[in-house]
């Protein structure tokens, strides 16, 4: 669980970070996704990428570089104001489109620079560039022109890949893939876990056989159910102990002040 | 027929420049691109990867700074710039598809790139 | 960074199993994938995510990958399929990694 901030040194430079959870190491937890995400690391004081397997780790793991500063840098939100009056879009906004590697199938943001718009695109999960925003928001904060009205956001198709037989260029598999729908699923508001956890067991795409758990946010237990290899969800677990510590913890009966990451 | 053609190598000296080439045919070479080296009598070891826009590239440490990946998507080439060349590059460079799951599913047939004064 | 480790060699008759390993930290968390190299040609892709086989690719080989170590096995091995065999995988911070290599021969 998180913890309040100690404002007892929240001045820019500080070596003492806001939450003790900033000062754990980068952890990728033992899953097999490949997700590119951000820790801050205490001994170089800034946040930096690594790549998260999709369960487990700790909770020094931010999904966007903006949050893990203003989340672990003390200070970070006042010097973020100076510097956005500035207005200047960074380079890696005009980056072209990169899905990466990987069968991640997730929704992202990127600023395309022939309509000036930030659309959507999916992401395998592994290498790719920065001009990848988790968030429509978040794109429009640092690459669209303030002047610009809110914009429709596009799709955009898969074709970049190499896959093992079919390329994915169907949106509603995509789409399937990316946000699976499941009437079992309680509303968010009862849940306050990992949000990987409310999504359905998913075999994934691949031919093998293995025993996983995922966590059933109906029963609030952890099933057995195999898992093909490849693609599937972060809600895949190699033991039901380390389902139950992940995704139990979520229940709204957990009284503490602190947000679980 | 799907294939990689690498092209571009030959003798030179230690702190030369040399640039391969990859041509692929049977197919549009529109995803991640590599190279992947061999020592002689030695094994593989990966040296770079690009997107397919172009927009990503990705470098072993022991060629960063030295070497730079680019390709042509108009020409369905993908090439191999080798600047501060040392004895160590000596080996055969092989291009590579990479799939989508993280491994080389089309090769070619490499070229050799020998630095020796 | 992941370092992945086979063995040099492997020897195996004729019609018997092969089996050469590829250890390395979690890497029951990764996926490996296995190449064939015959003198002087090109690395050929024979295993891919642990346990595919690639379209003709002989249904003899075949992958596993739990423990601490992931296994390339050919069962029935041929003569022809005496070679190097190198295991490679996708790490976050050194990217593609491949092992050593293996020799695998087959007597006789």
């Known amino acids: 669980l998180s913890e309040e901030a100690d404002d007892t040194d929240s001045e820019l430079g500080s070596m003492k970070p806001l939450h003790t959870f900033c000062a754990m190491k980068a952890d990728d937890g033992p899953c097999k996704a490949m997700i590119r995400s951000y820790f801050f690391n205490m001994y170089t004081h800034q946040c930096e990428e690594f790549i998260y397997g999709g369960c487990e780790g700790n909770e020094n793991r931010f999904d966007t570089l903006e949050e893990c500063k203003k989340t672990c840098i003390p200070g970070y939100e006042k010097t973020a104001v100076k510097a956005a009056s500035g207005a200047e879009r960074p380079d890696f906004c005009f980056l072209e489109e990169d899905p990466g590697l990987c069968r991640g199938y997730m929704k992202r943001y990127l600023y395309n620079n022939q309509t000036k718009q930030c659309e959507r695109f999916v992401y395998g999960g592994c290498l790719g560039n920065r001009n990848n925003f988790e968030t429509l928001d978040e794109c429009k904060k640092i690459c669209e022109n303030p002047v610009h009205s809110p914009s429709p956001v596009n799709e955009v198709q898969m074709s970049d890949y190499v896959t093992d037989g079919n390329t994915v260029t169907d949106r509603s598999t995509v789409n399937n893939i990316v946000v699976p729908q499941s009437p079992k699923v309680p509303r968010r508001r009862d849940y306050r876990g990992r949000p990987w956890c409310l999504q359905p067991a998913d075999s994934g795409l691949c031919k093998a056989s293995e025993r996983r758990f995922y966590y059933n946010s109906a029963t609030g237990k952890c099933h057995r159910f195999n898992y093909t290899g490849c693609g599937g969800n972060n809600n895949n677990f190699t033991t039901r102990r380390r389902c139950l510590r992940s995704c139990k913890t979520g229940l709204i009966k957990n009284k503490s002040k602190g947000v679980v990451k | 027929q799907v294939q990689l053609v690498e092209s571009g190598g030959g003798l030179v000296q230690p702190g030369g420049s040399l640039r391969l080439s990859c041509a692929a045919s049977?197919?549009?070479?529109?995803?991640?691109g590599s190279w992947v080296r061999q020592a002689p009598g030695k094994g593989l070891e990966w040296v770079s990867v690009i997107s397919g826009s172009g927009s990503s590239t990705y470098y072993a440490d022991s060629v960063k700074g030295r070497f730079t990946i680019s390709r042509d998507n108009s020409k369905n080439t993908l090439y191999l710039q080798m600047n501060s060349l040392r004895a160590e590059d000596t080996a055969v460079y092989y291009c590579?598809?990479?799939?989508?799951?993280?491994?080389?599913?089309?090769w070619g047939q490499g070229t050799l790139v020998t630095v020796s004064s | 960074d992941i370092e992945l480790t086979q063995p040099p060699s492997v020897s195996v008759a004729p019609g018997q199993t092969a089996r050469i390993s590829c250890s390395g930290d979690?890497?029951?968390?990764?996926?490996v994938h296995w190449y064939q190299q015959k003198p002087g040609q090109a690395p050929v892709l024979v295993i891919h995510g642990d346990n595919n086989r690639p379209s003709g690719i002989p249904e003899r080989f075949s992958g596993s990958n739990s423990g601490n170590t992931a296994t390339l096995t050919i069962s029935g091995t041929q003569a022809e399929d005496e070679a190097d065999y190198y295991c490679q995988s996708f790490d976050a911070g050194s990217y593609f990694v491949f092992g050593g290599g293996t020799k695998l021969t087959v007597l006789g």
């Open positions: 979690n890497i029951p968390e990764k996926y």
């Open positions: 590579a598809r990479v799939n989508i799951s993280t491994h080389f599913d089309v």
């Open positions: 049977g197919f549009t070479f529109s995803s991640y």
